[in-house]
Interface confidence: medium
């Protein structure tokens, strides 16, 4: 008898090369094979459970950056007046959550913030839990 | 044929709002659905394997905090004279291990240490390995 | 009916007690039960997907250390002029990749660098994806 295979794990890697003041970072998913989707510049959460979250990037100017998942809830990450980020976290997310950036710069420039190596990875840690597709 | 489902992954999130000098932090599991259990202020390990461990908290006073898993073994985390913690680690734990805190404060106060956002998450990374329930 | 078991997750913990200047760190796998293998001082990647990577160690002298996975690609970790490391990261690795160290010391000593608590852990996060054995 063939041993059972794992169904694909919900995971995604998105990249971002620019962020906008008082908005967020423009995210794109380089792979067509991701098991999670980007919609309206947010990563859509379909499955309840813990997620491993990795966030990296080098910014062209000092900024404050937060990563949110639900209106009215505190951020997953919050970094104040940084020019780079390289952070790992674990958070419990649920169906209907949306993971998105908020960015504030401290300059008066109207220019985009350029980002080198901007990468956000989410990996579901509780396969077998509730999912809604 | 229905694809096989994942059996639930061993994971738990416990919260702590206070710690006691020369003892530990009082942990509670806010969810009834956790796949791991708290007993005698410790998280009980039933399954061998690597665990992803996330530890967060803001303390009302400076303290030294260690997270242990087995008598006679070094700590999973050890932080000296801190007022906050936000750490991620990976460790190999095994059946019969128990994850618990040890705390020392450097004040002569008899009061508990209050904790904001105190959270400890454990997520098993090796489903399919040995478990004893 | 017996619920399906998980096939073993690809994971490994290797230890290293010494590193050589302008070469790497001598890695050994203490367990015979690892699901990943060491070959020519590298960890062999058989399965595509995200990996959780934990790297720890205390070095007998200051060094610069990088952890590579593929010729011509940037490092998974790069630490300059450090005497210790305690880092966690997430990276996408693929079949045929090999994870190995490169070390440079800034002394003229011909001696090996001694390492305390040198440990590298890799844990596959996408079971169900492509593997080649």
């Amino acid at each position: 008898q063939v041993p059972p295979q794992y169904p694909p794990i919900q995971s995604i890697r998105v990249q971002f090369t620019r962020c906008e003041n008082e908005k967020g970072c423009i995210i794109t998913s380089p792979s067509k094979d991701e098991t999670m989707k980007v919609q309206d510049n947010s990563i859509i959460i379909n499955c309840d459970g813990f997620y491993l979250i990795s966030l990296k990037g080098y910014f062209s100017e000092e900024l404050s950056l937060s990563l949110y998942y639900r209106k009215g809830r505190g951020p997953l990450f919050s970094l104040s007046k940084v020019t780079s980020v390289d952070s790992i976290g674990v958070a419990y997310l649920a169906f209907k959550d949306k993971v998105y950036f908020n960015v504030t710069t401290h300059s008066t420039s109207y220019k985009d913030i350029q980002v080198n190596g901007g990468e956000l990875i989410l990996i579901h840690q509780n396969p077998g839990g509730f999912c809604a597709y | 044929q229905v694809p096989p489902q994942y059996p639930p992954i061993q994971s738990i999130r416990v919260q702590f709002t206070r710690c006691e000098n020369e003892k530990g932090c009082i942990i509670t599991s806010p969810s009834k659905d956790e796949t791991m259990k708290v007993q005698d202020n410790s998280i009980i390990i039933n399954c061998d394997g690597f665990y992803l461990i996330s530890l967060k908290g803001y303390f009302s006073e400076e303290l030294s905090l260690s997270l242990y898993y087995r008598k006679g073994r070094g700590p999973l985390f050890s932080l000296s004279k801190v007022t906050s913690v936000d750490s991620i680690g990976v460790a190999y734990l095994a059946f019969k291990d128990k994850v618990y805190f040890n705390v020392t404060t450097h004040s002569t106060s008899y009061k508990d240490i209050q904790v904001n956002g105190g959270e400890l998450i454990l997520i098993h990374q090796n489903p399919g390995g040995f478990c004893a329930y | 009916q017996v619920p399906p078991q998980y096939p073993p997750i690809q994971s490994i913990r290797v230890q290293f007690t010494r590193c050589e200047n302008e070469k790497g760190c001598i890695i050994t796998s203490p367990s015979k039960d690892e699901t990943m293998k060491v070959q020519d001082n590298s960890i062999i990647i058989n399965c595509d997907g995200f990996y959780l990577i934990s790297l720890k160690g205390y070095f007998s002298e200051e060094l610069s250390l990088s952890l590579y996975y593929r010729k011509g690609r940037g490092p998974l970790f790069s630490l300059s002029k450090v005497t210790s490391v305690d880092s966690i990261g997430v990276a996408y690795l693929a079949f045929k990749d090999k994870v190995y160290f490169n070390v440079t010391t800034h002394s003229t000593s011909y001696k090996d660098i001694q390492v305390n608590g040198g440990e590298l852990i890799l844990i596959h996060q996408n079971p169900g994806g492509f593997c080649a054995y």
Partner: antibody, heavy 115, light 112 residues
Amino acid sequence: EVQLVESGGDLVKPAGSLRLSCVASGFTFSSYSMSWVRQAPEKGLQLVAGINSAGSSTYYTDAVKGRFTISRDNAKNTVYLQMNSLRAEDTAIYYCAKRWVFDYWGQGTLVTVSS
Amino acid sequence: DIVMTQTPLSLSVSPGEPASISCKASQSLPHSLGNTYLYWFRQKPGQSPQRLIYKVSNRDPGVPDRFSGSGSGTDFTLRISRVEADDAGIYYCGQGIQDPFTFGQGTKLEIK
């Protein structure tokens, strides 16, 4: 295909006002900063004003500060340049451009300030 | 403001011949994340400007590989390896590392 279409240029007397519009299509307008660049007759290019994607940060060249106002309506995919207290030296072709690095330009609209 | 000075102000080149335009900044254009925000634009007669090159040496989509950019610090160059009749127009360099974005005065390329 990215398109930027300017309108609103005209002949106007000194101290008069004009409002230029630029309608964008072919990209997610609300995600990008926008700029106005002008070119005086037989002269080079000069950045006049810029606005970030949210409309919360703006830039003006010193020569137009206090007289010109850049704004945007993301629902209408449109960026505006309100020009007051116009002077003869404001005579130019005004181009709308995408982002602060001007990766796409409109065809321009001519503003002539003369009595 | 950073002043961008182009040379020559005009040049006349036969089809198939190379052309080179220089752009000098009044101060060194620093890196930001390894990027230097130096751009080249072309304005054909009666048309709006079009960006050709971004960040010193990267061609915009649709720009032929006959066009190349190079340089660092204060000195930058646009080269056309083999000029064609359609290349006629005014070429501008511009810098975006420091506000405000400033342009060179332009170089007029005529085809003989």
